[in-house]
């Protein structure tokens, strides 16, 4: 089990249910988006391989004063072995495109749901 | 309007390879978001998933029939197939084809079936 | 495996009737709850997913509810085409289960 107890329920959350809960979360987001997500701030692109929690929390992080993505900081930071704090970019191994936030959150909805779908949980 | 048809058999001995085939219209394999799932129902118990198969060729089986279970798609031709080897008594049974889809939330509900076709298996 | 028990396997009603049936959870499945109609020629049909949410072209008279571990369904002002097997099944976590049915008779 992976111990993901902060925000979602109390005690450890298997696998399956917080990569669960963060696929909502993100769906969510996507689907309550009126204006643009974050007044349109631009985020660093991820490879969307090993580490890509930690470096989607890093890239995210630095998107200050969005409440619509505050959850989402939250739930990657328990996946993420490590503490990330704004301006790290150790798991960032790519630092060459910037995209918008919103369509950050899709690239990694549909990254996540196709871990889900094949089993994929840590 | 969206259909699914299964097609067997009918009837096949013990230790054979069960064929069964899933036609569907209505929508498209090559359709992001859409799967197809495969359940059989033994005569006077309950609904069993078997696997399923995504638009990406993702596959999923159940555990319990894992080694026994291989899901394949021919997405031009609109069919889905299944196959489970080496048979036996307990496999007699009615099999679904039903589609699912994934758009938003993952949640794994079946929203069309096919009328089911019946398999027994006799020495 | 999660497994999914409906503790009555038949249940007799009148028409015109307001009739619950009702589904656990061996675990919490997060409302990832399905109710399936399967009639008596063997048409399943989906009726509602995820706890609540009324799949297209169901009549309105369904309606499910519940969370955590238990749910149910409710068919309020029966009719003679609701005579039927429901079964609940469980989306949260594979592999997918079923419960084993209710079978609804008229009185």
């Known amino acids: 089990l992976t111990c993901l107890g902060g925000f979602a329920s109390p005690g450890p959350v298997p696998p399956s249910t917080a990569l669960r809960e963060l696929i909502e979360e993100l769906v969510n987001i996507t689907q309550n988006q009126k204006a643009p997500l974050c007044n349109g701030s631009m985020v660093w692109s991820i490879n969307l391989t090993a580490g890509m929690y930690c470096a989607a929390l890093e890239s995210l992080i630095n998107v200050s004063g969005c409440s619509a993505i505050e959850k989402t900081q939250r739930m990657l930071s328990g996946f993420c072995p490590h503490k990330v704090s704004a301006g790290q970019f150790s798991s960032l191994h790519v630092r060459d495109t910037k995209i918008e936030v919103a369509q950050f959150v899709k690239d990694l909805l549909l990254h996540l749901k196709k871990l889900f779908r094949e089993g994929q949980f840590n | 309007q969206v259909t699914l048809k299964e097609s067997g058999p009918g009837i096949l001995q013990p230790s054979q390879t069960l064929s069964l085939t899933c036609s569907f219209s209505g929508f498209s394999l090559s359709t992001s978001d859409m799967g197809v799932d495969w359940i059989r129902q033994p005569s006077g118990k309950g609904l069993e998933w078997l696997a399923h198969i995504w638009w990406d060729d993702v596959k999923r089986y159940n555990p319990a029939l894992k080694s026994r279970l291989t899901i394949s798609k021919d997405t031009s031709s609109s069919q889905v197939f299944l196959m489970l080897a080496s048979v036996d008594t307990a496999d007699t049974a009615t099999y679904y084809c039903?589609?699912?889809?994934?758009?938003?939330?993952?949640?794994?509900?079946?929203?069309?079936w096919g009328q089911g076709t019946s398999v027994t298996v006799s020495s | 495996d999660i497994q999914m028990t409906q503790t009555a396997s038949s249940l007799s009603a009148s028409l015109g009737d307001r009739v619950t049936i009702s589904c656990r959870a061996s675990?919490?499945?997060?409302?990832?709850l399905n109710w399936y109609q399967r009639k008596p020629d063997g048409t399943v049909k989906l009726l509602i997913f995820y706890t609540s949410k009324l799949h297209s072209g169901v009549p309105s008279r369904f309606s499910g509810s519940g969370s955590g571990t238990d749910y149910s369904l409710t068919i309020r002002n029966l009719e003679q085409e609701d005579i039927a097997t429901y079964f609940c099944?469980?989306?949260?976590?594979?592999?997918?289960?079923f419960g084993g049915g209710t079978k609804l008779e008229i009185k």
């Open positions: 039903a589609r699912t889809v994934s758009s938003g939330y993952i949640y794994y509900a079946m929203d069309y």
């Open positions: 099944q469980q989306g949260n976590t594979l592999p997918l289960t």
């Open positions: 675990q919490d499945i997060r409302n990832y």
